[in-house]
């Protein structure tokens, strides 16, 4: 299809090299009249379309994204080559930054329900760059966490070093839809809530004395509790003798419940003490099979191909630490009598 | 796979290390152990360092030996080598006590070609 | 210390035969004990483990049985590729005993 008569936008991601972070893209096509996606006489290829993500039409969830290739061949199905590129309903997200995802994207309905909508389509010029300038050292993360009860803040990445009065009006949306009220470099939440937690993007507008273009950045904002005062408190195995028999399999399961900690780093282990060896069984892997907003649950196995005698001499050591510190439980095996 | 190194003439009471290059698997993971074999005799074990560094000897080697172990090297150092230190020594890995991977019954599953000191004045 | 003893120190039989070696342990290790096939100028082979479990890849000619302190490899249907020394280990760690003992090695010479 002639992509001449697309709307164009102009968008840049400046990304920090220090960390992970995402970026999105909305198909920003004027608001549908009559199930309609849009007409040509509504908008002219010069005019840019207000930012409307989702549009709560059923519709507009079936948009199509391609990417225009610099050397001029044929529009390209985003979703057939780019791997680290994924469409959610309207919205495409970038999961890996880097200066390769620079380039056009052009997003169009998938149904094209009369001539006019031929037309009807997007095309935003995408520049990456990494972030060179030093100057602002401490700017907001793309990942930011609010203490649930508390009052806390959103800050735009690009924008953090700026102070309110520097800053130009940002437009603000949450989970792709346009939060109306924030204008400012910085959402103030008097009292954190976990509906607060989701998606955040925020865009301002740089100019320069040819054009200008959407400074965009994406933050993934996270509601979470204060940090855990406790050490993790096994759960299983609660017994210190465990009966068994000899020459069949057996797995020991250690659980442990580990208190939210911003900073987790949590350890769970298996040792066996023998005479005077004493060794770790790594394998196999922890896996948390409990994750909620104040704790979680991990557990790990230590599986022995068949019971022997050798085994009953020994003593299992399941040890589990964080940071505040550590809990052990030890299993002596006994045999099954008759 | 495993491979030994160092191995060469030596006078008596002059140290020496041989070291035991590992590939395939972590020294994390495993313990490794040093067997040694003089000239037309029998296998003789000499000890054992496991998975967290803790190292144990047989009775005869205790003071004599001493073994160590970076990433990928495991080292048996021959503090003061005497005439009967002459053999071929051979490290192994052990799936089973000192290793990661739990086992009922252990054994040294995988050995490598060996590496043969000779002490001689 | 744990001391293991192998006899015979040298047995010898017809391609297709049987032989059999012996180990005994001076102390109870509760089947922990492995059997390895050495050839000349090679290092020893995993044979078997755990008293009578073969290790992956080892012909079933390879038999072993035995508890407590008495021990035996059986291989029959002798090859000549069979010709080589045999040890046996005590894998039964004990803080009185040393870790990983081995017998004196029994030579098999296949006719």
């Known amino acids: 299809f002639n992509i001449s008569g697309c709307s164009t936008k102009k968008l840049l991601w400046t990304y920090s090299t220090r960390s992970e972070e995402e970026f999105v893209l909305f198909c920003d096509l004027p608001e549908p009249q009559k199930s309609h996606f849009c007409h040509r006489n509504r908008l002219s290829p010069k005019q840019v379309p207000e930012h409307l993500p989702f549009m709560g039409s059923n519709d507009l969830s079936d948009v199509q994204w391609y990417q225009q290739p610099s050397n001029g061949d044929p529009l390209e199905d985003i979703r057939k080559s780019y791997p680290h590129i994924i469409q959610d309903k309207c919205t495409l997200h970038f999961l890996t930054p880097g200066v390769n995802n620079s380039g056009s994207y052009i997003c169009r309905p998938k149904m094209i329900k009369s001539p006019y909508d031929v037309a009807c389509c997007v095309k935003m010029i995408l520049e990456v760059k990494p972030q060179t300038n030093a100057s602002c050292e401490y700017s907001a993360s793309h990942k930011q966490d609010l203490l649930l009860g508390s009052t806390g803040s959103i800050s735009c990445p690009s924008l953090s070093c700026q102070s309110d009065a520097q800053s130009p009006a940002v437009t603000w949306y949450k989970n792709g839809k346009l939060l109306s009220v924030e204008r400012s470099n910085r959402i103030v939440v008097d009292e954190v809530y976990d509906y607060h937690q989701g998606t955040y993007v925020c865009d301002y507008t740089q100019s320069d004395t040819v054009s200008s273009w959407t400074v965009r950045a994406v933050v993934q904002v996270r509601t979470i509790v204060g940090d855990t005062k406790l050490k993790p408190d096994i759960l299983d195995p609660v017994e210190d003798t465990l009966e068994v028999e000899l020459g069949k399999p057996l797995t020991i399961s250690c659980k442990a419940r580990f208190g939210f900690e911003r900073v987790f780093n949590p350890v769970i282990k298996w040792y066996i003490k023998d005479s005077d060896l004493e060794w770790e069984v790594s394998v196999p892997e922890a896996k948390s099979i409990k994750s909620t907003l104040k704790d979680e649950i991990i557990e790990r196995n230590i599986i022995l191909e068949k019971v022997t005698q050798r085994d009953l001499r020994r003593k299992f050591v399941c040890f589990v630490q964080n940071s505040i510190g550590n809990t052990t439980q030890s299993v002596q095996l006994k045999e099954k009598r008759g | 796979s495993v491979e030994e190194s160092g191995g060469r003439l030596v006078t008596p009471g002059t140290p020496l290390t041989l070291t035991c290059t590992v590939s395939g698997f972590s020294l994390s993971n495993y313990a490794m152990t040093w067997v040694r074999q003089a000239p037309g005799k029998g296998l003789e074990w000499i000890g054992i360092i496991i998975n967290t560094g803790y190292t144990y000897y047989a009775s005869w080697a205790k003071g004599r030996f001493t073994i160590s172990k970076a990433s990928t090297t495991v080292d048996l150092k021959i503090t003061s080598p005497t005439t009967e230190d002459t053999a071929t020594y051979f490290c192994?890995?052990?799936?089973?006590?000192?290793?990661?991977?739990?086992?009922?019954?252990?054994?040294?599953?995988?050995w490598g070609q060996g590496t043969l000191v000779t002490v001689s004045s | 210390a744990l001391v293991m003893t192998q006899t015979p120190s040298s047995v010898s039989a017809a391609v297709g035969g049987t032989v059999t070696i012996n180990c005994q342990a001076s102390q109870n290790i509760y089947s922990n004990l492995a059997w390895y096939q050495q050839k000349p100028g090679q290092p020893p082979k995993l044979l078997i483990y755990g008293a009578s479990d073969l290790e992956s890849g080892v012909p079933s000619r390879f038999k072993g049985s035995g508890s407590g302190t008495e021990y035996t490899l059986t291989i029959s249907d002798l090859e000549c590729d069979d010709a080589a020394t045999y040890y046996c280990?005590?894998?039964?760690?004990?803080?009185?005993?040393?870790?990983?003992?081995f017998g004196g090695g029994t030579e098999v010479v296949v006719k």
């Open positions: 192994a890995r052990v799936l089973g006590a000192g290793s990661s991977y739990y086992t009922s019954y252990d054994r040294l599953d995988l």
């Open positions: 280990q005590s894998t039964y760690y004990n803080i009185s005993a040393d870790f990983y003992a």
